[in-house]
Interface confidence: medium
């Protein structure tokens, strides 16, 4: 019995659902009563899911697996794995027995995008040309381990004096911290690129250091020019710094973070002490760094509703302020593709192909193409609906008239993360059958 699975690993984002495709060719007169289907972990032989004696025997794998019962009779033995975790990565074997038996193994490659790196500088005040500084580039919650590259402002690679560490959390996701030690010139830009080698996703940030004293008078408050991009559910640091003068003490400092538009108080430090969070108890300062001029704000468990501009007010004798933008993002899941009608298809038939991708932010851009990469723009209807958390589910519907055969692919792009998720469906045969291709 010939059992077919994809040659390439199935790549799935952590937290999304993955389909491990497996198919066989049923003979005429085949009935499900004859079918024994077993999915198991290739290495340990642990049972994952089975179908026997005409019945789905259910999931033996943390209750996160399902078959496609309506498609079994057509030879589709694929397994749906829900809420993928890092620990799911590996090889799954699909055993099919009717009279004969056959098996094939499919690899699941788990991935998670890395957050936009945050950059910190130590020391971060009174810098002069010739000083040695430590620049730390931190990016969070990615998988598998990242590749990290440093460059200067002219694109020259910086490979000496770089130390990179990657630490996995309980979920197996990596936080990467890369430290560059440099001797400052008159001024300089230092950029860090964190790549996810599976997703070929690049996250990068840069810091420009101008080692000169700020003019006397108003307090010069510095924040990043670019929006801080934070993934939903992760923590974000809204960087803000000032240059304390010699003899400065925290008793002199008034620091206020507020929402730029509504002036709602977020967090404050006055009278020599942290006055705490006035923003859903999800903010914190960096108390040990305040005396060095680091007035940054940590915002925990970022939500879509947090998106917007935050103003950092610093008052010592004089005062200064600057606003930093928070851009919230969430990656879209790999699209699922459905076909209507999905049987007895012939050239000339009109079919509706639906591409659905879930829980992303901000709204996605959706592109359709045929198997030659030709864009399909006519007869496409895309709707995006936000859930209670403000995350979007996108459903894009393509109506096409079938040719002799055809591949139709849908690409869902997160415009902030520049993250692409795509699915495709190939329709072949007379009468036509359909199957998913996952790239």
């Amino acid at each position: 019995l010939e059992v077919q699975v994809p040659e390439d690993p199935v790549v799935a984002l952590v937290g999304t659902d993955a389909t491990l495709c497996c198919s066989f060719s049923p003979e005429p007169g085949f009935s499900l009563a004859q079918l024994n289907l077993i999915w198991q972990l290739t290495d340990t032989k642990q049972l994952v899911h089975s179908f026997a004696e005409g019945q789905d025997q259910g999931s033996a794998y943390a209750n996160r697996t399902a078959l496609f019962p309506d498609l079994l009779a057509q030879g589709n033995a694929s397994l749906r794995l829900q809420r993928v975790r890092v620990a799911d990565e590996g090889s799954f074997t699909c055993f099919v027995s009717i009279r004969d038996f056959g098996s094939a193994a499919v690899s699941l490659q788990v991935a998670a995008p890395y957050s936009k790196p945050s950059m910190t500088l130590e020391p971060n005040k009174d810098l002069r040309p010739g000083d040695t500084v430590t620049i730390t580039c931190s990016s969070y919650q990615g998988y598998p381990e990242a590749e990290v590259f440093w460059q200067d402002g002219q694109g020259v690679p910086l490979t000496g004096n770089v130390t990179t560490s990657q630490m996995a959390n309980e979920q197996g996701l990596f936080d990467v911290h890369s430290i560059l030690r440099v001797v400052l010139g008159a001024n300089g830009t230092y950029s860090c690129l964190v790549r996810n080698p599976v997703l070929q996703q690049d996250a990068h940030s840069s810091v420009t250091i101008t080692p000169q004293r700020s003019p006397t008078g108003a307090v010069e408050v510095q924040v990043p020019e670019d929006p801080v991009v934070a993934l939903v559910g992760t923590d974000a640091t809204l960087r803000c710094s000032f240059s304390p003068e010699p003899g400065f003490s925290l008793a002199q400092l008034n620091l206020i973070w507020q929402l730029t538009d509504t002036k709602q108080l977020v967090h404050s430090f006055t009278e020599g002490r942290d006055q705490g969070s006035a923003y859903a108890n999800r903010t914190a300062l960096f108390p040990d760094l305040l005396a060095q001029g680091n007035a940054s704000l940590r915002l925990q468990r970022v939500r879509v509703a947090d998106e917007g501009s935050f103003t950092c007010f610093v008052s010592i004798r004089d005062f200064g302020s600057a606003a930093v933008s928070l851009q919230v993002a969430a990656p879209y899941s790999k699209p699922s593709m459905t076909l209507e009608p999905n049987k007895d298809l012939r050239p000339g038939d009109t079919v509706t192909i639906t591409c659905s991708s879930y829980r992303g932010y901000p709204e996605a851009e959706v592109f359709w193409q045929d198997g030659q990469g030709v864009p399909l723009t006519g007869n496409v209807t895309t709707s995006q609906m936000a859930n209670e958390q403000g995350l979007f589910d996108v459903h894009s519907v393509l109506r096409v008239v079938l040719g002799a055969n055809g591949t139709y692919s849908c690409l869902v792009r997160n415009p902030v993360l520049q993250q692409d998720a795509h699915g495709s469906v190939t329709i072949t045969g007379q009468p036509m059958t359909h199957h998913h291709h996952h790239h």
Partner: antibody, heavy 121, light 106 residues
Amino acid sequence: EVQLVQSGAEVKKPGSSVKVSCKASGYSFTSYTIHWVRQAPGQGLEWIGYINPNSRNTDYNQKFKDRTTLTADRSTSTAYMELSSLRSEDTAVYYCARYSGSTPYWYFDVWGQGTTVTVSS
Amino acid sequence: EIVLTQSPDFQSVTPKEKVTITCRASSSVSYMNWYQQKPDQSPKPWIYATSNLASGVPSRFSVSVSGTDHTLTINSLEAEDAATYYCQQWSSNPLTFGQGTKLEIK
């Protein structure tokens, strides 16, 4: 129009030196690094090194480090490559090129027309 | 040193044919650039930052990446594509080029 214009062809004796110039126009000369690349007859491209005209920082391919000097004159927006102790295998076309782009993606967007250096006794 | 190995060295192709050129890096690179060079001309930027087409480059050119393999594809070759193509990296010193792939039209 952004341009790099190189000096003319040179014929040199083994053991001598050659200095090739590359005059930049149409952009701020100090904003980008200038690289030198050579191509021997019928062969591929080989990187010699670069100079940052602003800081005058240089870096060289180890293979050329002992025999090459890269300089830049900001007043005339001209970069120079001097190669000493010439031997016959240094016969090649020498190109200057601007390394341009934006963080973190850079590439050689403008090339000079090339200077043919022939080393022959 | 990161060594870039292009394959094939030479390819003779008929117009309208699909062509692939692979550039394999000996270790990970931050990004790859590609240049086109025709006889007696300076190289021209062709593809930068792994997969972005330089100005004026036709859309029949594309690049895909798998691990350290970067594959340049021309999906329907035209006569004007006859040239030598070089890949280039500068993730670490020294900056290196591939040895080049020469495309000839049959």
